[in-house]
């Protein structure tokens, strides 16, 4: 951890590498002071998507994250964003380790390690820091695509990561185009995959206290279909009266089996977007349909709470496509003076 150059304030720590995910274990009651890079200007700290106030026990102040005395509820994900561009400068997870609050003099000092800040961190066997990014194990991708497998982990001492293919050490030397091992990102990247890349890819993460592993199964398809295509204008912006029934339509074209999700955009703690930049959504319906069918979302007896943005999300083994529409719900007495739908056109998006 590098020390800040700001001398007029109390020293603070800066996470090791910018734009790298990092996990820090903090003792209960310990003060935390973290810098957001080497400048104090134009940097804001967020916790779980909400910007930290500049005053209080936990505050984001002059580009610094300050916690007077670490409490269990302070654990979580913290982001430092550059104002304007909203670039993520630091992506940090703080974990609480209350074992540090009761260190007695007769403990074996080898079980603890200290950082340059003078804070003491316990040694810890490797663990997954973002298991939600490892939820999908079985992969099937078209030949020519780029494949990225990630096993984000942490531990103390900092663990090392090794990759195996079908149980054997894998360095990509026999692979045309080789591989990219990005140890800081705990990732393996293979570009332009071919059928000979099929297999089981295992990340082995280990330090002196233990090891963990996770396997991905990769199939390479010798064809190149496209992600789903959604018919323009569907779903359509709709205006309805309280108590009426509404149908939102989504017509999907896909040569690969499409899966459809209907999402409703929601607001959490006054925000429509999470710290990752993605909107907060509620999944209303998930279904598999046969190609070129119309998928319908039925909303019965709508109320004012049903108003808002709805998204039809279609995915297949190649990628995702989505389109959105707005539902306006009017009280019954308003029916006489407006029948217009909102001005905004449906949104059209395609994502790989």
């Amino acid at each position: 951890l590098e020390a800040s150059e700001e001398m007029e304030q109390e020293p603070c720590l800066a996470p090791i590498l910018e734009q790298q995910e990092q996990v820090l274990t903090v003792a209960l009651g310990q003060p935390v002071r973290l810098c957001c890079g080497r400048t104090e200007r134009g940097r804001h700290w967020y916790k779980e998507g909400s910007r930290l106030a500049s005053a209080g026990r936990v505050r984001g102040w002059r580009g610094r994250l300050e916690i007077a005395s670490f409490l269990p509820e302070d654990a979580g994900r913290y982001l430092c964003l550059a104002r304007g561009s909203m670039t993520v400068v630091h992506n940090l997870t703080l974990l609480m380790d209350d074992s540090l609050t009761s260190i007695s003099n007769d403990e074996d000092p080898k079980t603890l390690s200290s950082s340059s800040s003078g804070h003491v961190y316990p040694q810890q066997a490797p663990y997954w820091t973002h298991p939600q990014r490892m939820e999908k194990k079985l992969h099937a991708v078209p030949a020519g695509n780029t494949v990225k497998f990630r096993c984000p982990a942490a531990g103390n001492p900092m663990p090392t990561i090794h990759w195996l293919k079908d149980g054997q050490a894998f360095h990509g030397e026999n692979r045309i185009g080789g591989i990219r091992l990005r140890h800081q990102h705990w990732s393996l990247v293979m570009e332009s995959v071919v059928p000979s890349d099929r297999g089981t890819y295992t990340c082995l993460v280990e330090n002196s206290l233990g090891s963990i592993r996770y396997s991905y199964l990769l199939d390479v398809l010798e064809r190149s279909p496209h992600r789903p295509i959604l018919q323009a204008g569907l779903p359509a912006n709709t205006t309805a009266v309280v108590g009426s029934d509404v149908e939102l339509l989504c017509k999907v074209y896909s040569d690969a089996q499409p899966h459809i999700q209907w999402l409703k955009h929601v607001v959490i703690n006054g925000s429509s977007f999470g710290a990752d930049g993605f909107p907060y959504v509620q999944v209303l319906k998930t279904t598999d349909i046969n190609s070129s069918e119309v998928e319908v979302l039925y909303l019965r007896n709508v109320s004012a709470e049903d108003a808002g943005e709805y998204t039809c999300l279609a995915g297949n083994s190649i990628g995702l496509s989505y389109q959105s529409a707005w539902l306006t719900v009017l009280p019954e007495e308003d029916l006489t003076w407006t029948t217009a739908t909102p001005e905004a056109a449906s949104h059209h998006h395609h994502h790989h």
Epitope: W128, P131, M134, E135, K136, K137, L138, A140, G167, P195, R198, G199, T200, T202, I212, R213, Y214, S215, L217, L218, D219, V220, L221, E222, A256, Q257, H259, T286, D288, N290, S291, G315, N316, S317
Partner: antibody
Framework: EVQLLESGGGLVQPGGSLRLSCAAS????????MGWVRQAPGKGLEWVSV????????IYADSVKGRFTISRDNSKNTLYLQMNSLRAEDTAVYYC?????????????WGQGTMVTVSS | QYELTQPPSASGTPGQRVTISCSGS????????VHWYQQLPGTAPKLLIY???QRPSGVPDRFSVSKSGSSASLAISGLQSEDEADYYC????????????FGTGTKVTVLG
């Protein structure tokens, strides 16, 4: 309607062979990982094998490795399990199942099963 | 054969809450998503719930799951007679090679 229909079960002597089939309908078979799961009479579920969409990647439980072969014919929407050197402990109902990425790689669709009895 | 351990049986009266535990290791539940299956008497298993309380359509929200470390549990609140079935947890396992493993199974009986 999404459906899986197994066939090919029956009575076979120890050391004998049998080939099970699973006909898929109602979904694009060639885009799914598929597997076999078995259940001995009065016992729990045991995973047997899985095959990738292209058929190019197969994985087996240790208990059947070297004796069973999973395969598929995407043009016929059919999954197969070739069982050789059968033993009494292979007696079970064999289920064909689909693994779905949207169900986080769980087996989301199952067939009704076909009974395999290994006995002399 | 079984890497995941479940209690053989659980029971409750209608309306009660029943919980089934599923114990594994770091190579299966500790690193992988847990799936739960329900098998009604004389029928094929069906996917009941997976991941972070995600359910196939038609599965009531009386069923919920939790996971901590290398263990998981399935809770059935407001037990109903139609919940009488065998329940299996399952997970992919990465110990030496990837494979899929089921729990030993739990028979849920609705009393009265």
């Amino acid at each position: 309607e999404v459906q899986l229909l197994e066939s090919g079960g029956g009575l076979v002597q120890p050391g004998g062979s049998l080939r099970l089939s699973c006909a898929a309908s109602g979904f694009t078979f060639s885009h799914y990982w598929m597997g076999w799961v078995r259940q001995a009479p009065g016992k729990g579920l045991e995973w047997v094998s899985v095959i990738s969409p292209s058929g190019g990647l197969t994985i087996y439980a240790d208990s059947v490795k070297g004796r069973f072969t999973i395969s598929r014919d995407n043009s016929k929407n059919t999954l197969y399990l070739q069982m050789n050197s059968l033993r009494a402990e292979d007696t079970a109902v064999y289920y064909c199942a689909r693994s779905s990425g949207w169900a986080l790689d769980a087996f989301d669709i199952w067939g009704q099963g076909t009974m395999v009895t290994v006995s002399s | 054969q079984y890497e995941l351990t479940q209690p053989p049986s659980a029971s409750g009266t209608p309306g009660q809450r029943v919980t089934i535990s599923c114990s594994g290791s770091s190579s299966n539940i500790g690193s992988n998503i847990v799936h739960w299956y329900q098998q009604l008497p004389g029928t094929a298993p069906k996917l009941l719930i997976y991941g972070n309380n995600q359910r196939p359509s038609g599965v009531p929200d009386r069923f919920s799951v939790s996971k901590s470390g290398s263990s998981a549990s399935l809770a059935i609140s407001g037990l109903q007679s139609e919940d009488e079935a065998d329940y299996y947890c399952a997970s992919w396992d990465d110990s030496l090679k990837a494979f899929y493993v089921f729990g030993t199974g739990t028979k849920v009986t609705v009393l009265g």
